[in-house]
């Protein structure tokens, strides 16, 4: 197996009860071949379901900064630039993996964590609830 | 846990030249406190910029399966259910972190990798380029 110089307080991976751990190289390789710098950059403003981006920071998480989208309105923007409440703005959400320091504040020990983030908004036709 | 035949060239973390590595517990903790089961589940169909989800599978990546959104139309769906080409359907993209087996086929050695995924689509007003 892999042996690492161990801090006495760090988890013992040889313990049979210890959850499965792996080695991860944190030098990030960027596979984004898309060189278009714009990408989604101005969509938040041009969308019929515009959104604002909010910075979510957590030093115990890697990456520590995640941007969260919040839809500006409950309705959607129509051709006249007004909000049309016959349509709904909804967040497009995605589950992503992050690394959470565990135990807290440990520089070299993490746990994979799944979090739900809102990436942007889209305009949908409302669900009509028919009253019997 | 996952068992994979070990590549004889798997790294020795005691090597001083080995890039910064950390221990990661792969037992995923799910922090999604949002109990709304609907989430984005049916938005892909109800959106004015509908999309299809395509399965992207790669056994050398963790998670091995990622769903990619592809907008169905260049335009957006109008109130009559027709495609309006005066508006544009565009993908909302997000950079996410994944783990890439490195060297390939190693069960316990990964490198962090950043990839760009399309999560869904939104309807935007086109950029009008005026010809001089």
């Amino acid at each position: 197996g892999i042996t690492i110089p161990r801090n006495p307080g760090c988890p013992n991976s040889e313990d049979k009860n210890f959850p499965r751990t792996v080695m991860v190289n944190l030098n990030i390789h960027n596979r984004n071949t898309n060189t278009n710098p714009k990408r989604s950059s101005d969509y938040y403003n041009r969308s019929t379901s515009p959104w604002n981006l909010h910075r979510n920071e957590d030093p115990e998480r890697y990456p520590s900064v995640i941007w969260e989208a919040k839809c500006r309105h409950l309705g959607c923007i129509n051709a006249d630039g007004n909000v049309d409440y016959h349509m709904n703005s909804v967040p497009i959400q995605q589950e992503i993996l992050v690394l959470r320091r565990e135990p807290p504040h440990c520089p070299n020990s993490f746990r994979l964590e799944k979090i739900l983030v809102s990436v942007g908004c889209t305009c949908v036709t409302p669900i009509v609830h028919h009253v019997a | 846990g996952i068992t994979i035949p070990r590549n004889p060239g798997c790294p020795n973390s005691e090597d001083k030249n080995f890039p910064r590595t950390v221990m990661v517990n792969l037992n995923i903790h799910n922090r999604n406190t949002n109990t709304n089961p609907k989430r984005s589940s049916d938005y892909y169909n109800r959106s004015t910029s509908p999309w299809n989800l395509h399965r992207n599978e790669d056994p050398e990546r963790y998670p091995s399966v990622i769903w990619e959104a592809k907008c169905r139309h260049l335009g957006c769906i109008n109130a009559d259910g027709n495609v309006d080409y005066h508006m544009n359907s565009v993908p909302i993209q997000q950079e996410i972190l994944v783990l890439r087996r490195e060297p390939p086929h190693c069960p316990n050695s990964f490198r962090l990798e950043k990839i760009l995924v399309s999560v869904g689509c939104t309807c935007v007003t086109p950029i009008v380029h005026h010809v001089a």
Epitope: C71, R72, G75, P91, P126 | -
Partner: antibody, heavy 124, light 113 residues
Amino acid sequence: QVQLQESGPGLVKPSETLSLTCTVSGFSLPSHSVSWIRQPPGKGLEWIGIIWNNGGTDYNSAFKSRVTISVDTSKNQFSLKLSSVTAADTAVYYCARNMYITDYYYENYFFDAWGQGTLVTVSS
Amino acid sequence: DIVMTQSPLSLPVTPGEPASISCKSSQSLLFSENQKNYLAWYLQKPGQSPQLLIYWTSTRQSGVPDRFSGSGSGTDFTLKISRVEAEDVGVYYCQQSYYTPYTFGQGTKVEIK
């Protein structure tokens, strides 16, 4: 703690521009949006407009042609400008913080902290 | 614009007794995507600025006593004070945050008998 404080001239002449400043402390500007709300003497509350965390704005259409809301993040200050004022613009003007809820994916238009308000009289 | 209509406009109360204020909206404030009603209640005490009591119809803002409760859905909403205390006097406003511009009711003045 969270504080908002409005300041500006208490008297403005008709047809001139009303200019107010809201200085905030105790919260992060990049997270929160701020609205301006007014209350004519003895009357109810009227929402004027909002400036979002990214500097974007949205205005009540009743004021749209003559209102501007801006922010100077270096000074933690928001400003309201209302042009071509008349006696009907006499009111107590409040700046208020829009509530921020972490796991909620819409901008919020409830107001969870208010300034003490400043009375602006429009008179010649 | 959405019209918010409160009743009564004036409410004399006895300390220790319950009190109730009604607010009606000219359009439904129920958002179909999350089943939340976009209605809030504020109290403006004499000489002070308004303070948020309740949002999303029934969620109490932190620090607000549990004698305050909100109910309703769609267009009809109610604020109840289970046992009025002397410090509860002032003008109560309902506010909708569904439609822009975001509008307030005309206010209900609560005073001790």
